[in-house]
Interface confidence: low
């Protein structure tokens, strides 16, 4: 807390300018009018204040706006934003994408801080959904942002916003998140032709059901092994050897290197060995020839 003292004669600030960097903390507190500071916040960012001086400026704004800063001030906080606590930010009502961009730009190049997470949460809740422009902005800063959301939060993403998602934005998503995103992506890209559709949908396929994988296998898509290994095991198991061969195209040879890993391992165990032999890859572990194959999936579901 800065002690209240009278402003020395001739030191009353008329403008927010570089002369203030020579003021002691108590002089800033006494000589800078909070309302003046609020109207000239855009200048603060260009002045090399010390962290201690920024603390004083923040304190003045806190006194002026105990219920939370107005957006006109928030947009021009600049590096003062880094001084804000999540509790401060929860008082704000940020509605402008420009304001969000301005504050994210201050934090650019750093990991997502609790302050930024709170800011984004306030912004998205205020908008009611993650629209395309917001998503585009957030993933430009934080490629992992999408995967930090719960499936419930992701359900508010409209299909049109999926166009803003880049493959790297989904790198850390788990299957539950992809389960939510995949149907939206399928809807968003439904009017694209085969090869273009596959390029766009590829990163979302960890949420695809068996029937969609079967459909893709008929389109000469040549799925790479990295994508195949991210598919849901329960979606891969019902695929036939012929369907997997068509789905992977020339990449089918990569199955050998992955035969001990899911979902390839579990898929091999469900195939007839003589079907696996047709691939010529030396995959072992299929159902021996002559054995009767029973579909136990219903029994498993009941037990």
């Amino acid at each position: 807390e800065v002690e209240k003292t009278a402003c020395p004669s001739g030191k009353k600030a008329r403008e927010i300018d570089e002369s203030l960097i020579f003021y002691k903390k108590w002089e800033l507190e006494a000589c800078v009018d909070a309302a003046l500071l609020a109207t000239q916040m855009d200048r603060v960012n260009a002045i090399p204040f010390t962290y201690e001086q920024l603390d004083v400026l923040k304190h003045k704004l806190d006194e002026l706006y105990p219920q939370g800063y107005p957006e006109s001030v928030i947009q021009h906080l600049g590096y003062l934003f880094l001084k804000m606590s999540p509790e401060d930010i929860r008082k704000w009502n940020v509605t402008s994408l420009e304001t969000l961009k301005a504050l994210l730009e201050v934090n650019k190049g750093h990991e997502m801080s609790p302050q930024v997470a709170t800011l984004i949460d306030r912004f998205v809740k205020g908008r009611g959904q993650l629209d395309k422009d917001t998503l585009d902005t957030l993933t430009a800063f934080y490629p992992g942002y999408l995967c930090s959301l719960s499936p419930e939060e992701l359900s508010s993403v409209p299909p049109s916003s999926i166009w803003a998602v880049r493959p790297q934005d989904l790198d850390t998503c788990d299957p539950r998140q992809l389960d939510v995103l995949y149907p939206k992506a399928r809807l968003a890209f439904q009017n694209m032709n085969g090869s273009e559709y596959f390029v766009k949908i590829q990163s979302f396929l960890g949420g695809a059901p068996t029937e969609d994988l079967k459909a893709l296998s008929q389109q000469n898509v040549s799925m790479d092994l990295a994508t195949f290994m991210k598919l849901r095991t329960d979606a891969v198991l019902p695929l036939t050897v012929a369907e997997v061969q068509k789905l992977l195209g020339p990449h089918v040879e990569g199955l050998k290197a992955e035969e001990r890993h899911r979902p390839v391992r579990d898929w091999i165990l469900r195939q007839r060995q003589d079907d696996l032999d047709t691939l010529g890859l030396g995959l072992q572990g299929g159902i021996p020839n002559g054995y009767l194959v029973l579909d136990l999936s219903m029994q498993e579901a009941l037990s």
């Epitope: 855009d42 960012n45 260009a46 947009q75 600049g78 420009e98 961009k101 301005a102 730009e105 201050v106 650019k108 190049g109 902005t137 430009a140 490629p143 880049r166 493959p167 790297q168």
Partner: antibody, heavy 121, light 110 residues
Framework: QVQLVESGGGLVQPGGSLRLSCAAS????????MGWVRQAPGKGLEWIGY???????YYASWAKGRFTISRDNSKNTVYLQMNSLRAEDTAVYYC???????????????WGQGTLVTVSS | DIQMTQSPSSLSASVGDRVTITCQAS??????LAWYQQKPGKAPKLLIY???DLASGVPSRFSGSGSGTDFTLTISSLQPEDFATYYC????????????FGTGTKVTVL
């Protein structure tokens, strides 16, 4: 059409200062981040820095302190102020516009023709 | 500080050849990479952004690929007007960097 025109280049003595201007036409400067890039004779491209739509500036580590980027949206012009110039600052200086309006860090889609700055006694 | 290493520094090729230029980042830059073409005495021209998106008006023989740290610019069938110098640029970070551009690759007639 969309165009950038640099001006203000020329011969300057070591230790001197120069201000380059970049006049934009065909689009609203206020909507785009703008950057400056230079190229010494026979050398590669060297990024100087840029100014964002909200007037935040970013500089290459070597340019901090000597070079200042500013903009005047009312004149649709961006500036590069260069101080304490050295012989190694001799180069063609380009201004460039970001691809996407309102944002930074995608790449420069529109470039000026460049202006030559020669630092020599 | 993200360093960009471009290779080769120069190459000779003939019209119709398939040409590949690579760019390596010293750390993960996701797909935040642009490619430019520059001819002598001219300003650079944007070819590719976001690693693989073709800029407006650029012929489809140019393509970009890669993400993370390794990127490639490919010219599927070299044309006479493609003899130039090519530069990559990381656009992941603008903080505390020396130069986001690669060193350049000069493509000349064999």
């Amino acid at each position: 059409q969309v165009q950038l025109v640099e001006s203000g280049g020329g011969l300057v003595q070591p230790g001197g200062s120069l201000r380059l201007s970049c006049a934009a036409s065909g689009f609203s400067l206020s909507s785009y981040a703008m950057g400056w890039v230079r190229q010494a004779p026979g050398k590669g491209l060297e990024w100087i820095g840029y100014i964002s739509t909200i007037n935040n500036t970013y500089y290459a580590s070597w340019a901090k302190g000597r070079f200042t980027i500013s903009r005047d949206n009312s004149k649709n012009t961006v500036y590069l102020q260069m101080n304490s110039l050295r012989a190694e600052d001799t180069a063609v200086y380009y201004c460039a516009r970001e691809i996407r309006s309102g944002w930074v860090d995608y790449g420069f889609s529109i470039w000026g023709q460049g202006t030559l700055v020669t630092v020599s006694s | 500080d993200i360093q960009m290493t471009q290779s080769p520094s120069s190459l000779s090729a003939s019209v119709g050849d398939r040409v590949t230029i690579t760019c390596q980042a010293s750390q993960n830059i996701y797909s935040n990479l642009a490619w430019y073409q520059q001819k002598p005495g001219k300003a650079p021209k944007l070819l590719i952004y976001d690693a693989s998106d073709l800029a407006s008006g650029v012929p489809s023989r140019f393509s970009g690929s890669g993400s993370g740290t390794d990127f490639t610019l490919t010219i599927s069938s070299l044309q006479p007007e493609d003899f130039a110098t090519y530069y990559c640029q990381q656009v992941r970070s603008s903080s505390d960097i020396d130069n986001p551009f690669g060193t350049g690759t000069k493509v000349t007639v064999l």
